[in-house]
Interface confidence: medium
């Protein structure tokens, strides 16, 4: 026996709802970046530490790693920086950048997170000469929730909370479960609304009958977990030419491009340096 099949537009809607947390942080138009900043969403209770991981795929000898908070008006507040093997805190020492033994991963931690720490965060890296490149990670969202002091009761203690990277998993699983539950709910509603479907007459597919491939088959939905984009970048990526006094050294500025794109673009020699007056 088959199960009632819901109309595809409804399934599509449910799937989109199910993917909401990831979808919120997605923009298919933002270029791919080699830097990653995870988890994409993190929820902690006030007073707890909040940790994101900034991953640099290849770490040059000389680089600067910066950690930022982004305001709704696209202003950045640099929280901390890492250069030449030591971390330099910003004006608030609760913000720490720690290099992990892998050398490619950096823990960016807010110690004793406060409610007003909720917001959008990202890391940026500048690879210094001779191979100058600039990268920016996807954005990630931190939510700091208020601690609700519940009166003591006889009820058993709540299960331990997942913090840090476990939160990403919780959010993902929760969103999928919500999607599944909504799908089941819709199926039940449809079964009630269209009793004919429950009798197996035409509306049901046989268990032996696979879904047909081809143009009439159901659309495939993919979710591209990208980064939050409120038209924050001022420009479309193009490597800049240095405006230099002498034509001695050409830096290569790499701007994130889509996966599979040619990668670092060298500076165009015809751009030339910016002449210094004699």
């Amino acid at each position: 026996m088959g199960t009632p099949r819901a109309p595809w537009p409804l399934v599509w809607a449910v799937l989109q709802l199910g993917w909401w947390p990831g979808w919120l942080l997605d923009s298919p138009y933002r270029p791919w970046s080699p830097l990653t900043f995870s988890p994409a969403q993190l929820t902690v209770l006030e007073g707890e530490n909040a940790t994101f991981v900034c991953h640099l795929p290849d770490v040059p000898e000389s680089f600067v790693l910066n950690w930022y908070r982004v305001s709704p008006r696209n202003q950045t507040d640099k929280l901390a920086a890492f250069q030449e093997n030591h971390t330099e805190p910003g004006k608030d020492r609760r913000f720490r950048v720690t290099r992990l033994p892998s050398g490619q991963d950096f823990h960016t931690t807010i110690l004793a997170a406060q409610l007003n720490d909720s917001g959008i965060y990202l890391c940026g890296a500048i690879y210094l000469p001779p191979n100058t490149q600039i990268y920016e990670s996807p954005r990630a969202e931190l939510t700091v929730k208020e601690r609700v002091l519940e009166p003591p009761t006889e009820s058993p203690s709540p299960p331990p909370r997942l913090t840090g990277q476990g939160q990403g998993l919780v959010v993902g699983v929760t969103s999928v479960l919500v999607g599944v539950l909504l799908l089941l709910l819709l199926t039940w509603v449809l079964a009630a609304a269209f009793p004919r479907a429950t009798r197996g007459a035409c509306a049901c597919g046989s268990e032996d009958e696979p879904l047909k491939e081809g143009p009439s088959a159901a659309p495939v939905f993919t979710v591209d977990y990208g980064e939050l984009d409120f038209q924050w970048r001022e420009k479309t990526p193009e490597p800049p030419a240095p405006c230099a006094p002498e034509q001695t050294e050409y830096a290569t500025i790499v701007f994130p491009s889509r996966p599979g794109s040619p990668g670092p673009l060298p500076l165009r020699p015809e751009d030339g340096p910016c002449p210094w007056p004699l």
Partner: antibody, heavy 124, light 107 residues
Framework: QIQLVQSGPELKKPGETVKISCKAS????????IHWVKQAPGKGLKWMGW????????TYADDFKGRFAFSLETSVSAAFLQINNLKNEDTATYFC?????????????????WGQGTSVSVSS | SIVMTQTPKFLLVSAGDRVTITCKAS??????VAWYQQKPGQSPKLLIY???NRYTGVPDRFTGSGYGTDFTFTISTVQAEDLAVYFC?????????FGGGTMLEIK
Amino acid sequence: QIQLVQSGPELKKPGETVKISCKASGYTFTDYSIHWVKQAPGKGLKWMGWINTETGEPTYADDFKGRFAFSLETSVSAAFLQINNLKNEDTATYFCARPLFYYYITSPRSMDCWGQGTSVSVSS
Amino acid sequence: SIVMTQTPKFLLVSAGDRVTITCKASQSVTNDVAWYQQKPGQSPKLLIYYASNRYTGVPDRFTGSGYGTDFTFTISTVQAEDLAVYFCQQDYSSPYTFGGGTMLEIK
């Protein structure tokens, strides 16, 4: 080669308006913001603000809100600074400049390419 | 806005001397500091960005260091052509303020 070329010197009376141009060449104009910097005679540098060359949205430092206006003419890769109701204290050299890096939210705003400056003299 | 206090205002040195200029920010600007050189009648030129990184083509006698609120710019061996005014600038937060400048004169 990358260049920012500014318009020539201006001699104005108080209350008049001046419009300075900054013409970019050697790079894609809309890929970098344009910043404006004031230098009064014998004084230091004062950052006035910048304009997003893609959207045309200006950002002004507090001291330059009101009588000052940044604008663009992207078809000719030019940025403009207009000062209305000129005052004696507007007498200065005004520079346009381009930041070192293509504009990314995390880019340093250090300016590696500067126009030659436009001298504005306001005197009755 | 962030105030950049630059010292000294004037320096009179001989060719071959070592020169140090300091800039103090009124609050932490992490490493978002640049140093510029402005020769008489010319526009400024970028020498150092991100506090310690030399810009393309800048001779290695020019160095920068510092983090947070205290920054130093050094010319290890002054040459006659270094006669100029030197400015620091913070590009940590808008408005991107400059120091008052240091005029370097050669004896």
